[in-house]
């Protein structure tokens, strides 16, 4: 009620002979501040003095002065709010009540707290989960209802007497609540734990020993198993007897059912810890193992490999690969269940024993045709040998062999045949699909493997083919050999190396690019007259006359091929010159007389010069000299001159008679 | 200073039975548990089994359990591990480690190489 | 039981460089993880215990973190004398214990 002292304390304190007791404590006075306060140790109210009797641990004077044997016990409190108190060391005769005695001006009150010293320090107290299981995270706690802060301790965790490698968090409460020291560890149990020793120690300050707890874990787990077998080896022969025996090692709690398993899946019938299998076969052979149940859940022995051994069954033959290609390695695996394995095998080649091959694989490091055929093989161990399977086929596949080009005409071919080609070759695997034929033309195929060409070109020197499956092989090329008429005839001027001029050497050369057959013979032609039969026409002195156009012809067995006509000129200084007059060499004056200086000249004249009777060159350079009109002073005889780039040529004298005129004539 | 040796090299045949010994010195033998620990070649380490050398209790790996027995001696702070039936897959060298306790250091011995072969 | 999982199988770093492993546990093992190293026939030595906490005598550059299921070992400057195989170990189920399988650092 509103008439009470406010006070908060821990209801008790537990502490030991020679430790501390400290008690946290907070009050609230009815008036004003607290004047007076006494610690009392089993107070006792005395009716008739109306005050209280007791030992007095502490007093406080009004003055604040403590008597110097009240050392032990401090009121470490203030006049208003705090009441805490410490008594270092505690001693086994301070256990019982202790009275607080606060008086404020007007108002007084007794609050009182129980104390528990023991004469030896007290075990801490573990707490344990209602539940462990294995392998999850469990939270033992160790709880000791003490804590002082002149008197330091430690809770160490162990396992069996030594301590836990674990982390442990210690926490400490000194509050008006409680007051109280825990250790809190954290692991994860194994099934293996259960049943061991778990103790709390609670230590001083040097880690001498003060007392502890101990707990025995009960850790649930699945059942732990050890599968036992006879014989130890788990090695028999088809027909032997083999015994298996599950030993539960471990279980919490009970088990409740046993199972067998083989390659993972349960035996029916076998519920019990032992597994008896009579007169094994092969198909026994695999990998046991016990299954036992409790409420945790199923729990597996280790796997026993059991081998019933056996003779090896009929083989097969597998091949790395197939087909293989001539030239690559191909790797036979000769397959063939038995037990122990086989320790010996035997290799046919087409029913033929192969020597010296007594491996499980055989290797061929590059294969050939002659590779191909049915291997098989026989399988051997120490129980016997096996039956030899049907065995494996190998293909060996390889490009055409011996590839040839053959011509089917009768030789020798000549330009513009028709000439039929044919492929050939030896053997293929696989077989040949197409055929290439080089150089490339417009040629027909008539047939697989056969070439057709028309109208053969005299140029058609080598034909090659291919013929091919998934490779192609060609065969060497083979000459056609096109026999043809001389090509390229043409007619060469040797010497001079310059133009020819008249009086010059001059030799004249039949060429031809090519002829097939080599032998030919020569003709030179100019006109449509034979001039020669040799590959060159010589002239020793060219003469103007020799111009002309010339043609050569080259022949063979074939036929025979004319050149173009090739012109040959003759360059010559102007000849035949002479002096022509028109209309005559008499005229009568008044009229025209036209001189013309006719030449022959190569090239022609290009510069002519007129001489009179005194030879004195006259003011004409043209080819014709016109009088206009003609006066009888011009009678008299003319030449001229003509000049090219050869040289000059000259006239002979022709006369001029001008007469005159009748007019004239009647004047005179 | 703490020190743990261990026994030496052993050459076994498969069925046969190993015991190697640890024994630890510089420290209370008895305050702390001994754990046995493998390496096979290349391989990974396994935890075989711990022993509390105050009162010998045991604790094994499961799949060890049944060949496996881990003793102490701790009148010359010794520590064996016996292993039976021996099999081709227990070549390995084996370790025995004292337990940190509170310190949190641990220590190891130099390891006994053990091959087992026919 | 707990599995742990080291990763990368195989680390390649320069001297001087910074290496970090990682090690993650199936399940919760707080701090209750240890660093080993191991050299070629040499007992594995304790780095870290406690996660984070450095053993006796181990240089500063050797640093643990993590808890519960990742847990990181950092070398923060890789001296020559650290190219090794790197454990780490669970004891949250101690006496039984479980390791990785290792991380090996070798020189890039």
């Known amino acids: 009620d509103s008439s009470k002292w406010v006070f908060e304390h821990p209801e008790t304190l537990y502490a030991w002979e020679g430790a501390c007791v400290w008690i946290p404590c907070t009050y609230r006075a009815l008036d004003g501040d607290l004047e007076s306060f006494i610690l009392f140790h089993n107070p006792e109210y005395n009716k008739n003095t109306s005050k209280f009797d007791g030992t007095r641990l502490y007093e406080s004077t009004k003055d604040g002065k403590v008597p110097s044997e009240q050392k032990r016990v401090q009121f470490l409190g203030d006049k208003n709010k705090n009441c805490t108190l410490s008594i270092h060391p505690v001693h086994l005769n301070d256990s019982g009540q202790l009275g607080l005695r606060m008086e404020s001006k007007t108002e007084k009150w007794m609050e009182r707290i129980h104390l528990n010293v023991s004469e030896r320090p007290f075990p801490p107290h573990i707490q344990l989960p209602p539940e462990i299981q294995e392998s999850q995270e469990v939270t033992l706690t160790c709880l000791l209802n003490f804590s002082c802060y002149g008197y330091p301790i430690q809770l160490q965790w162990l396992l069996e007497g030594v301590p836990m490698r674990q982390a442990a968090v210690t926490s400490t409460s000194l509050t008006i609540k409680s007051v109280f020291t825990r250790s809190e560890l954290k692991f994860s149990p194994q099934w293996s734990h259960h049943g061991k020793i778990v103790t709390c120690q609670l230590q001083d300050a040097d880690g001498k020993f003060l007392s502890n707890d101990t707990v025995q874990l009960n850790v649930k787990h699945t059942p732990k198993l050890e599968i036992k077998v006879t014989p130890s080896d788990a090695i028999v022969r088809e027909g032997d007897s083999v015994t298996m025996t599950c030993e539960v090692s471990s279980s919490n709690p009970e088990y409740t059912t046993v199972s067998w398993l083989k390659d993972g899946t349960s035996l029916k019938k076998q519920n019990t810890f032992t597994l008896n299998l009579r007169e094994v076969t092969k198909d026994q052979s695999g990998k046991y193992c016990c299954q036992v149940s409790n409420d945790v859940g199923p729990g597996r022995s280790e796997e026993v490999f059991l081998q019933v051994q056996y003779a090896p069954e009929p083989s097969t033959v597998q091949i790395l690969h197939s087909p293989a290609v001539e030239g690559s390695q191909v790797e036979f695996l000769c397959m063939s269940l038995a037990n122990p394995l086989p320790t010996n095998y035997t290799w046919y080649h087409n029913g033929k024993e192969m020597q010296g091959r007594t491996e499980e694989k055989v290797h061929i490091p590059k294969i050939l045709p002659w590779h191909a055929g049915t291997y098989s093989c026989v399988a051997e161990n120490i129980l016997g040998t096996g039956q030899r399977g049907p065995g494996a086929e190998l293909d060996v596949q390889y490009p055409p062999k011996k590839v040839t080009t053959v011509i089917q005409n009768p030789m020798p071919i000549r330009e513009g045949d028709t000439v039929t080609l044919s492929c050939n070759y030896n053997s293929s695997n696989p077989s040949v699909t197409r055929y290439e034929w080089k150089p490339h033309g417009a040629w027909e195929e008539p047939s697989l493997g056969v070439l057709k060409i028309q109208n053969v070109g005299w140029d058609n020197t080598t034909i090659a083919c291919a013929a091919c499956n998934s490779w192609c092989s060609w065969a060497s090329p083979v000459a056609l050999n096109v026999q043809y008429a001389p090509r390229d005839v043409r007619v060469r001027k040797i010497k001079p190396l310059s133009e020819i001029h008249s009086g010059n050497s001059v030799s004249l050369q039949c060429d031809f690019s090519s002829s097939h057959p080599k032998e030919v013979q020569f003709f030179w032609e100019k006109n449509g007259r034979l001039l020669g039969k040799e590959s060159q026409l010589n002239f020793d002195s060219i003469s103007p006359e020799d111009a002309g156009s010339y043609s050569c012809w080259v022949n063979n067995s074939i036929g025979q091929t004319a050149s173009k006509a090739w012109t040959l000129e003759v360059l010559y200084a102007p000849r035949r010159l002479r002096v022509s007059m028109s209309p005559g060499d008499q005229v009568m004056e008044g009229k025209s007389a036209t001189l013309t200086c006719e030449s022959d000249a190569n090239p022609p004249v290009s510069h002519y010069t007129w001489f009179d009777w005194n030879n004195q060159s006259l003011p004409y350079h043209s080819q014709k000299l016109r009088l206009e009109p003609v006066k009888v002073q011009h009678s008299g005889a003319y030449w001229c001159q003509g000049t090219n780039s050869v040289g000059k040529g000259r006239s002979p004298l022709s006369t001029l008679t001008v007469y005159y005129s009748p007019e004239t004539i009647g004047r005179r | 200073q703490v020190q743990l040796v261990q026994s030496g090299a052993e050459v076994k045949k498969p069925g046969e039975s190993l015991k190697i010994s640890c024994k630890g010195s510089?420290?209370?033998?008895?305050?702390?548990?001994i754990s046995w620990v493998r390496q096979a070649p290349g391989q990974c380490l396994e935890w075989m089994g711990w022993?509390?050398?105050?009162?010998?209790?045991?604790i094994y790996a499961q799949k060890l359990q049944g060949r496996v027995t881990m003793t102490t001696d701790t009148s010359t702070s010794t520590a064996y591990m016996e292993l039976r039936r021996l099999r081709s897959d227990d070549t390995a060298v084996y370790y025995c480690?004292?337990?940190?306790?509170?310190?949190?250091?641990?220590?190891w011995g130099q390891g006994t190489l053990v091959t087992v072969s026919s | 039981e707990i599995v742990l999982t080291q990763s990368p199988a195989t680390l390649s770093v320069s001297p001087g460089e910074r290496a970090t492993l990682s090690c993650r546990a199936s399940?919760?093992?707080?701090?209750?993880l240890a660093w080993y190293q191991q050299k070629p026939g040499q007992a594995p030595r304790l780095l870290i215990y406690?996660?984070?906490t450095r053993a006796t005598g181990i240089p500063a550059r050797f640093s643990g973190s993590g808890s519960g299921t990742e847990f990181t070992l950092t070398i923060s400057s890789l001296q020559s004398e650290d190219f090794a195989v790197y454990f780490c170990?669970?004891?949250?189920?101690?006496?039984?214990?479980?390791f990785g399988c290792g991380t090996k650092v070798e020189i890039k």
């Open positions: 510089g420290y209370s033998f008895t305050s702390y548990g």
């Open positions: 399940l919760s093992v707080s701090s209750n």
């Open positions: 022993i509390s050398a105050y009162n010998g209790n045991t």
């Open positions: 480690a004292r337990d940190p306790g509170v310190t949190g250091d641990d220590y």
């Open positions: 170990q669970q004891y949250h189920s101690w006496p039984a214990l479980t």
């Open positions: 406690g996660a984070s």
